[in-house]
Interface confidence: medium
Amino acid sequence: SAPGEDEECGRVRDFVAKLANNTHQHVFDDLRGSVSLSWVGDSTGVILVLTTFHVPLVIMTFGQSKLYRSEDYGKNFKDITDLINNTFIRTEFGMAIGPENSGKVVLTAEVSGGSRGGRIFRSSDFAKNFVQTDLPFHPLTQMMYSPQNSDYLLALSTENGLWVSKNFGGKWEEIHKAVCLAKWGSDNTIFFTTYANGSCKADLGALELWRTSDLGKSFKTIGVKIYSFGLGGRFLFASVMADKDTTRRIHVSTDQGDTWSMAQLPSVGQEQFYSILAANDDMVFMHVDEPGDTGFGTIFTSDDRGIVYSKSLDRHLYTTTGGETDFTNVTSLRGVYITSVLSEDNSIQTMITFDQGGRWTHLRKPENSECDATAKNKNECSLHIHASYSISQKLNVPMAPLSEPNAVGIVIAHGSVGDAISVMVPDVYISDDGGYSWTKMLEGPHYYTILDSGGIIVAIEHSSRPINVIKFSTDEGQCWQTYTFTRDPIYFTGLASEPGARSMNISIWGFTESFLTSQWVSYTIDFKDILERNCEEKDYTIWLAHSTDPEDYEDGCILGYKEQFLRLRKSSVCQNGRDYVVTKQPSICLCSLEDFLCDFGYYRPENDSKCVEQPELKGHDLEFCLYGREEHLTTNGYRKIPGDKCQGGVNPVREVKDLKKKCTSNFLSPEKQNSKSN
């Protein structure tokens, strides 16, 4: 039988009446066009909705926008357009919401052509009030908040000036001209690239990388011949042009650009690119594009300094610079990532790693599924997940994979079961153990979201027709109930729930159409009465993450330690609640070869835990450049995975000798770097 329709499914009692009493409709009068929604703060219940309608005229486009505010998670909205003087807000800048619970909001207004500068509306009280501020420049980008201090803003102007405000946008100062890209680092530091001659495009590869740690009082040039730069975890990366040709190499710094090392990664040519797929304070996943228009490249994983890299995955699908990759961090279980590879026959297959890139495997075939037409052997196939690439190809995939840190082990995704991703209409699959095993959860494409830290999963069928039914599950997707939330169907445009998956409210957005007009409408459903009581100790069970062989003493060991979690029993219908904290008990493991990545010059053949020398480097001395000195690496092929906490057990030899020789990395060496003050 179809999922959720077998005899074992117990129904949630009287749910229709309970949900009907907690379903709140809001019709947005006389509005068409586009709508954008932002949550202001965490657990505040404040939502801002901006609707815009562009009216195309022969010569120009003018628009109207309306601003609405809710302070009860979307159950009621108040039109607050008058607080922004009925000004047309530019949707391409979105609503710039301040970090954490600062309550800050910046809206960028459309101004007439001849004006001296742009205009913003600022709120620091969760959008209860706004202050209009005329800018001394026309913004090119959305205002960016410093992560450390929400009063500090930066923006680039249309004339490539870097502007900074120290009082939440009240007063602005241009701290540098000819700026291409600017980013906040840690401790209110700003990193930015500048051009000397023509423009950002013309000087690509000849840009300078600058740093200011005092909001523009003084500057330090920390790099030259820069193509681009990026920040990830505690690492600062720059791609730098080589002296002799048009190739670029990645350089990395862990001290805000004071010292740099050349990353042991292949150089790339003009048509290629590097991309930081994921980064934390321990390590980095880096994609290096293959030469030619192949649509794939190689994933490398770094050591704890971001310098020495090991090959992690070949033929990694990544279409073009700024293009599509399916690389997904499964946030509901440590060490798990999912992505796609482009196989030799140009089919796309999904791969998963449970140990932060150490080893990749196919996804296990779901128990309740048949292999589709892509499978050569009808009994042997795997699950393939649809993510960004499928969405970009306009396949019938409304949503990317979903996981939440506080819904431990749960991963929801569209997929197909075969030898490769299928273009047929996908179904929705769920894993409750972080990707080790999967079950078909819903037939056909759906929108889905997680509420109450996994206590409720909500889904809406993806259809071109108007809809009026929502599905929900209180047992991690095993059984489903359907609820008709409105008599008159609506064209569905999106599900919105508060980020963090702690809320029990879901908003269904769409529009109704009468004969000539359409109106935005939202239905907010509060599930609090479905989960009538708070969860107690008896509602939770102990679960060992990454468990594959309960007989094995080392079962569950990943990255040198195992974790036991308290997880809600599927049969328990209760509230985790907004204050729910994931309870876990870690324990250290003995080291095995699984705790080591292959060192520079080594690789791990498929289905083997041993690292072997790369043929092209056999017999060569392994030397690399570190902080401008040449280092000699003595290794038997292993290095500990960053973040691995194992102790004892296997301990491969690894030694780095300073060769006391200078080496250059196409970068300004620290002693030559200059500083200047404003």
């Epitope: 169907p489 529009f511 159409e513 004969f515 000539l516 359409s518």
Partner: antibody
Amino acid sequence: QVQLVQSGAEVKKPGSSVKVSCKASGGTFGSYAISWVRQAPGQGLEWMGGIIPQFGTANYAQKFQGRVTITADESTSTAYMELSSLRSEDTAVYYCARQGRKTGYYYYYGMDVWGQGTTVTVSS
Amino acid sequence: DIQMTQSPSTLSASVGDRVTITCRASQSISSWLAWYQQKPGKAPKLLIYKASSLESGVPSRFSGSGSGTEFTLTISSLQPDDFATYYCQQADGHITFGGGTKVEIK
């Protein structure tokens, strides 16, 4: 090429009802709007109401509210207009017309395809 | 409901004449106006939508202008096939037609 084909002429007694059908062929039906417009002999055009078949909800001109019912069956690409409590002044040619529209936007394209018209005569 | 007033109700003209028909709305309807041509015993035919957009297949001698409450249909050079009745129609919320303008041979 979309065509709207209407049902044949009707002669009705005062107080009775008439139901006129309008079948679309040769194109999509659901996402458009269908209007019903009537024209009494020697008179101008009068809009009665309309429906978006995909939604099934109809809008009516105030004058006809309570007396007219407009429905649509997407599976057969057919729209219907039923007028009740007929009187002699309801004698007219009744047209259905397709109305181009852009989903989610207030954007009116005009009635670009018309049926051939159905003559309804109300006489005792 | 919004009232649409068309003028003149009858217009006599000759082939080659430039003909202008006016339509006034009782309140602003932005640009949500269409013009139709109807010949005796036939269904109306769409000429102009959104006040000034020419429906495909309609000769370029027909043009529409105006916004808000005042709208105009112009036939730049009247042809024998153009003798007919012309209706304006607004589409702001509900639909209403103007009373019609009959263009006859002078």
